[in-house]
């Protein structure tokens, strides 16, 4: 028995057709993606293949401004024009609160939502019950499928899930649901989840009875033969697994941002074990043509993106210095404010030892394009933002080495004095430079906000310890020449979209007026 | 809406066999198991079996199994339940239920059918 | 197989009184429990599923709890209507399983 498995993951909001960066379409013969390009590929899909399902392996929220403006309800509504068979909670599907889950999204979906490692409890469980499931048995075809979910257990660190969820061990809560699948003589399970590419492995692996990942979260890219566009596979498409009871798991994920349409055919026995599989992601490019009722659809509800984005988030009364001429060359109130936006967006008072886990902030001065001028009424709009933040990138959370950090901070002024974008603004944090040194050595004080203290203080940075950092996407990934902090990472997690936290940050304040304050000093 | 209608009162003797049908409307047939839950008089319940309609896959009570068969009809979205080898003690009401294949609680229920062993 | 232990067997109670029936369950059986009610001579009725999920139509006063192995059915304030008896049932591990009944009276 033929099974087609059709996947997405980390869509992160782009409803509409992407460039190849997977940012704001520009010419549209060259995009990429969109609901209405993916609708296409599945129907063709569908029409010629028996038995096929179609899953999503979380985060469909936050990303651009579709998810500012309709707040998932898109993401319902599109996901159930697609008819989606099943979706798994991922951590930013929380960004909003468990309200800003269960009304727009689990109340809406016409598919089950999964997560076997959530469990709710006090007020919030009887209003939340039955509207995710740890699993669903879906009939394909003469045969049935259970499918598992489970959801990142950082994600109270990484979104906003509130007081009342627990986030369990993935394998721990597995198990027992997979055991439960067995029971009801379910003997063709798939593990659909967002706990990123390492833990698909490790559930592969551990996890008695699943017989195939679908992942998400770490944006992994698998590939057999030559890839199609620009992203580099980080191994074959599917990635086998061998569990400890010595059967083969594939284990799949298919990049991110709707850019390509995970394509996975397994082959079962009638004892419902894998014999083979095989596949490849499909990219999603403009040979494959919109599907012209999704596409008059996402242009009705795009009608109200373009209102938005004119409408006041906020005022500033000073001028908010986002210039090259500052940004790149000293520490710029444009800056700050975007710094002081990510780390408030990171508040998460988790354990009574820390007032957060996270306080500190990097930001490379090239990703700040415009400055705002404060005499147009002091008006803030997502326009003037999307001048400012222009390439749509996040705001991710990483774990660094104190040595890694140093590193980051000597690069940042390697060749000062050029314009060159890799000069570093902060928050939570203090450096001293001293440009007479010779480049590599050119950092004389590194002091950084305590986390682990009631009352915030600046402390010198230790190099062997391990701090948590707010930065772009862009630094993540060693943009900019910050190779270091890519090849010496010890965890990223995908943010929130870069203008969406300022955005937010501004609306909540109301009334901003950054301040240069000394957090960059040159001796 | 909803409904789960089965056939009528039976008396059966001792070692015979009886078959109760149960039809189904209101709902997709195919989507969900109808389960049989006995109930003898003034007694408690006792869950027998199920059958997925959707593609014949049956769940026993390993207590019945060898004495009952669950066949089904989707061309008339009926159920059947035919209980062999009857003794006096299978004198109950046999009731049919709708449940999710995949969480098996009951949520319809069918009126019951009263199977009287009596020699 | 499960057993699901339900208790009192009977009690008797009136009108406004908040009545708790308990089902022990005898391993964990991960909250898939539900809850029905039966009066003489009709086919049960399912009140709740999932320990606390209230079935559409079932009033606000019949609420559940518990984890684990313990489960408890709570009837806020009893009515009229409410006089019948109760069964719990397990859906974690076939066979599927019944408590034996609580028989509600009226005192």
């Known amino acids: 028995w033929e099974l087609t498995i059709l996947h997405t993951n980390d869509v992160h909001s782009r409803l509409e057709q992407t460039s190849e960066d997977s940012s704001k379409c520009v010419n549209a013969s060259r995009c990429m993606g969109g609901v209405a390009r993916l609708f296409t590929k599945v129907q063709q899909i569908r029409r010629a293949e028996p038995n096929v399902l179609l899953l999503d392996a979380g985060d469909q929220y936050q990303g651009t401004i579709w998810f500012t403006v309709y707040k998932g309800a898109e993401v319902a509504h599109f996901m159930n024009a697609l008819r989606y068979d099943a979706m798994a909670l991922g951590n930013h599907e929380f960004d909003n609160g468990v309200e800003g889950l269960i009304e727009p999204l689990l109340k809406e979906a016409k598919f089950p939502i999964l997560s076997a490692n959530i469990k709710a409890k006090g007020p919030l469980a009887s209003q939340i019950s039955g509207l995710y499931l740890p699993y669903k048995v879906l009939p394909v075809g003469d045969e049935v499928v259970g499918i598992v979910g489970y959801t990142s257990k950082e994600t109270p660190f990484l979104s906003n899930p509130g007081t009342n969820l627990v986030f369990e061990d993935e394998i721990t809560a597995l198990q027992p649901e997979v055991d439960k699948l067995k029971t009801l003589n379910v003997n063709k399970i798939i593990a659909l989840g967002h706990s990123g590419f390492e833990m698909d492995k490790l559930i592969a692996q551990k996890v008695r009875g699943v017989d195939v990942v679908v992942g998400g979260h770490s944006n992994t890219f698998l590939y057999t033969g030559n890839p199609p566009s620009k992203e580099v596979p980080a191994g074959k498409y599917p990635f086998i697994v061998t569990s400890d009871d010595g059967r083969k798991v594939p284990v799949v994920q298919a990049y991110a941002f709707g850019k390509y349409l995970g394509y996975l055919k397994i082959e079962f026995d009638e004892r419902g074990n894998v014999i083979s599989s095989h596949g490849n992601p499909i990219l999603l490019n403009s040979s494959i043509p919109e599907d012209p009722s999704i596409k008059a659809d996402i242009n009705k509800w795009r009608i109200k993106l373009d209102n938005y984005s004119t409408q006041e988030l906020g005022k500033t009364i000073v001028y908010l210095d986002g210039s090259s001429q500052s940004c790149r060359f000293r520490e710029c109130n444009m800056g700050n404010l975007i710094c002081d936006a990510m780390i408030n967006n990171n508040l998460r008072h988790t354990d009574e030892m820390f007032w957060n886990h996270v306080s500190m902030c990097i930001l490379n001065g090239g990703g700040i394009r415009s400055p705002i001028d404060e005499r147009n009424n002091g008006t803030i709009t997502w326009e003037n933002l999307a001048a400012v933040l222009p390439f749509g990138g996040t705001f991710d959370l990483v774990q660094l080495k104190g040595s890694t950090l140093k590193k980051a901070f000597e690069h940042s002024v390697h060749r000062y004095g050029q314009s060159t974008g890799e000069f570093l603004q902060v928050g939570g944090i203090h450096v001293v430079y001293d440009l007479s040194r010779k480049p590599g050595d050119r950092v004389v004080k590194l002091d950084v906000l305590c986390t682990k203290c009631r009352v915030p203080s600046y402390d010198p940075l230790k190099m062997d310890e391990v701090y948590k950092v707010i930065l772009p996407n862009f630094l993540a990934n060693g943009g900019d020449g910050f190779q270091m902090i890519k090849d010496e990472l010890l965890r990223h997690d995908s943010g929130d979209q870069d203008i969406n936290v300022v955005s937010t940050y501004i609306s909540k304040m109301k009334v901003i007026y950054p301040a240069v304050e000394g957090r960059i000093k040159f001796s | 809406q909803v409904q789960l209608v089965q056939s009528g009162a039976e008396v059966k003797k001792p070692g015979a066999s009886v078959k109760v049908s149960c039809k189904a409307s209101?709902?997709?047939?195919?989507?969900?198991?109808i389960h049989w839950v006995r109930q003898a008089p003034g007694q408690g319940l006792e869950w027998m079996g199920a059958i997925f309609p959707g593609n014949g896959h049956i769940s026993y009570n390993q207590k019945f199994k060898g004495r009952v068969t669950m066949t089904v009809d989707t061309s008339t979205s009926t159920v059947y339940m035919e209980l062999s080898s009857l003794r006096s003690e299978d004198t109950a009401v046999y009731y049919c239920?709708?449940?999710?294949?995949?969480?098996?609680?009951?949520?319809?229920w069918g009126q019951g059918t009263l199977v009287t062993v009596s020699s | 197989d499960i057993q699901m232990t339900q208790s009192p067997s009977s009690l008797s109670a009136s009108v406004g009184d908040r009545v708790t029936i308990t089902c022990k369950a005898s391993e964990g059986i991960y909250n898939r429990l539900a809850w029905y009610q039966q009066k003489p001579g009709k086919a049960p009725k399912l009140l709740l599923s999932g320990v606390i999920s209230l079935e559409t139509g079932v009033p606000s006063r019949f609420s559940g709890s518990g984890s684990g192995k313990d489960y408890t059915l709570t009837i806020s304030s009893l009515q009229p209507e409410d006089f019948a008896t109760y069964y719990c049932q397990q859906y974690w591990s076939i066979p599927w399983t019944f408590g034996g009944g609580t028989k509600v009276e009226i005192k």
């Open positions: 239920a709708r449940g999710d294949y995949d969480e098996s609680y009951f949520d319809y």
């Open positions: 209101g709902y997709t047939f195919t989507t969900y198991n």
